[in-house]
């Protein structure tokens, strides 16, 4: 990515060209990174301490997992050194619909650069994928999945709506939240939105641009719920069982709509991270602002993706992009400041620990180690056939 003057907007610290922030570690290893996953958890509830201990046992990661209240399932990580870090958040994908054969709605990625102090506590909720409508262990539902049973289509034909045989929409994907605590109040750094759940019915894919918020004075509301649940936002409240919960309320995924559960137990719950539960329409994705679900139970209405967020304390390094096909992730790395390089890209030589600038294709690094110049073309050689003739 080409991103010039990266720290211009950073209110915390101005970095002089070629300088990285003070380090507590004598040797900076740019290859070190910390990858946070769902620890094997899936569905509407987050991981336990035991799951994360097991998942990270052969890695450089050690986390404490919240066990009760709104922090249940949230991974708490202590920053190892004062430094500038890149934090990549990836929201989870929404669930597939029963007859919706297109790919699931991908979770959003957001990458930001932040200055963090040694022993800062980062709170990390890794979003979990919304549940798929198919396949199902329930024979009755599986017959719908494979096209042997058309009770939904029949009800639509007769009533022009779905009520008795509701269900078959995917659950909304959970958002991935990275935040700090200030005086006991969560302060968001990055929120990567979850994808909306797909509706039961197949239809042409509609393009919705990724939405990104960077103003924390904007209210972090839940998405609107209909028969399916809206996605959970940052700090809203809901009493609806099928709505995704906001981070403030624990960010659990919503249940399937009551109609679907009551008739045939078609369970398509939203993912942890505020995914809304599915009905015949899809559940909304979690986010800073949750994604809306259809106001009725339209079996062709996908749930909306949530809205992503980046704190003004950080710098957005890449635009929000829909990339995640499954559960979310968080990847934290030491950030190497390359703003002195002509193309803002560099790497650290692992032996000399010197910063070496990159150049675009067709150019080479000048002697100043910063500028890029057009590579000098060598003298053209005559073809061997001409020399021999």
């Amino acid at each position: 990515p080409k991103s010039r003057n990266l720290f211009e907007r950073n209110p915390n610290k101005e970095l002089k060209p070629g300088e990285n922030s003070p380090r507590q570690t004598p040797i900076f290893d740019p290859t070190v990174h910390w990858l946070f996953t769902t620890c094997g958890a899936s569905g509407p509830h987050g991981p336990t301490q035991a799951q994360c201990n097991n998942a990270y046992q052969n890695s450089n990661l050690s986390v404490e997992v919240g066990s009760e209240g709104p922090l249940k399932g949230i991974q708490i990580w202590k920053v190892p050194a004062t430094d500038t870090y890149s934090i990549s958040g990836y929201g989870a994908a929404g669930g597939k619909g029963g007859k919706n054969t297109m790919m699931r709605s991908h979770g959003v990625s957001v990458l930001g650069i932040f200055n963090l102090e040694k022993d800062d506590m980062l709170y990390i909720l890794v979003g979990q994928q919304g549940e798929d409508a198919c396949p199902s262990t329930n024979q009755l539902i599986q017959k719908v999945c494979i096209g042997e049973n058309n009770v939904i289509e029949e009800e639509i034909r007769v009533n022009r709506s779905v009520h008795e045989w509701a269900g078959g929409g995917g659950g909304g994907g959970g958002a991935t939240y990275v935040f700090k605590m200030k005086d006991g109040v969560p302060v968001p750094l990055i929120i990567a939105a979850g994808g909306g759940g797909r509706a039961y019915g197949a239809k042409t894919d509609t393009f919705h641009p990724e939405r990104l918020e960077n103003n924390s004075s904007v209210l972090g509301l839940n998405g609107n719920s209909g028969a399916a649940g809206g996605g959970g936002g940052w700090n809203d409240n809901t009493s609806l069982l099928w709505a995704g919960k906001s981070l403030q309320e624990g960010a659990t995924g919503g249940h399937s709509c009551p109609q679907a559960m009551k008739k045939w137990g078609w369970e398509t719950r939203g993912g942890f991270g505020g995914g809304g539960g599915g009905c015949s329409s899809g559940g909304g994705g979690g986010g800073y602002i949750g994604g809306n679900a259809a106001s009725n139970n339209d079996p062709e209405m996908d749930g909306e993706d949530g809205v992503s967020f980046i704190s003004p304390l950080g710098i957005l390094y890449t635009p929000a992009l829909k990339v995640m096909e499954g559960h979310g992730e968080v990847n934290i790395k030491h950030y190497l400041n390359c703003s002195h390089c002509e193309v803002d890209e560099c790497h650290m030589d692992p032996e000399s620990h010197k910063v070496i600038c990159f150049c675009d294709h067709g150019t080479v690094l000048a002697e100043d180690g910063v500028s890029c110049i057009v590579s000098p073309t060598p003298e053209p050689h005559l073809p061997l056939s001409l020399i021999l003739s």
Partner: antibody
Amino acid sequence: QVQLQQSGAELVKPGASVKISCKASGYAFSSYWMNWVKQRPGKGLEWIGQIYPGDGDTTYNGKFKGKATLTADKSSSTVYMQLNSLTSEDSAVYFCVRYYYGSSGYFDYWGQGTTLTVSS
Amino acid sequence: DVQMIQTPDSLAVSLGQRATISCRASESVDNYGISFMHWYQQKPGQSPKLLIYRASNLESGIPARFSGSGSRTDFTLTINPVETDDVATYYCQQNNKDPPTFGGGTKLEIK
């Protein structure tokens, strides 16, 4: 693990009412129908009715309409069955039973039963 | 209501032999290509326990010597081979139509 814990045995007089309870644990209480089934000594099983705790929706066997009233308390994950105008015919063991896969499913977990004796 | 007739009322089988219990519904209990017929076991002084759901599916944790078959109105529960632990009363139940109804039960004893 799923558990259904019923209240203890009851001895009541004819004409009175009784309310028996069934506390559920180990699953999403609001998302599954809870049923009640009657078994008289040495007799078969009779379905009384069901309640969906998520929204309080109820369905009754016509034979028990006016006899049984089902309620649910989501905060305590407990369902209740009130039986009124009791007669000796109501002396039986009553089971609460979870429906799995909605009302088109099957009874997968049963409470231990509550013995009701109606006698003067 | 759908009537469920179980036969026989009682059955005595030698250990290691096959026990067969029949259940006949007064009308078809099939719908959407599925039989809404289930079998339960009740041991003396205990609650009923699910054995077979939707005619032929073995509930998790139930030994494979239990099996179910049939469709529409005629269904069979088979226990082969019978063990002492199988002494109980067995009930069939339909829920294709409300109200759900049970058979009268078949009491299995060891000969």
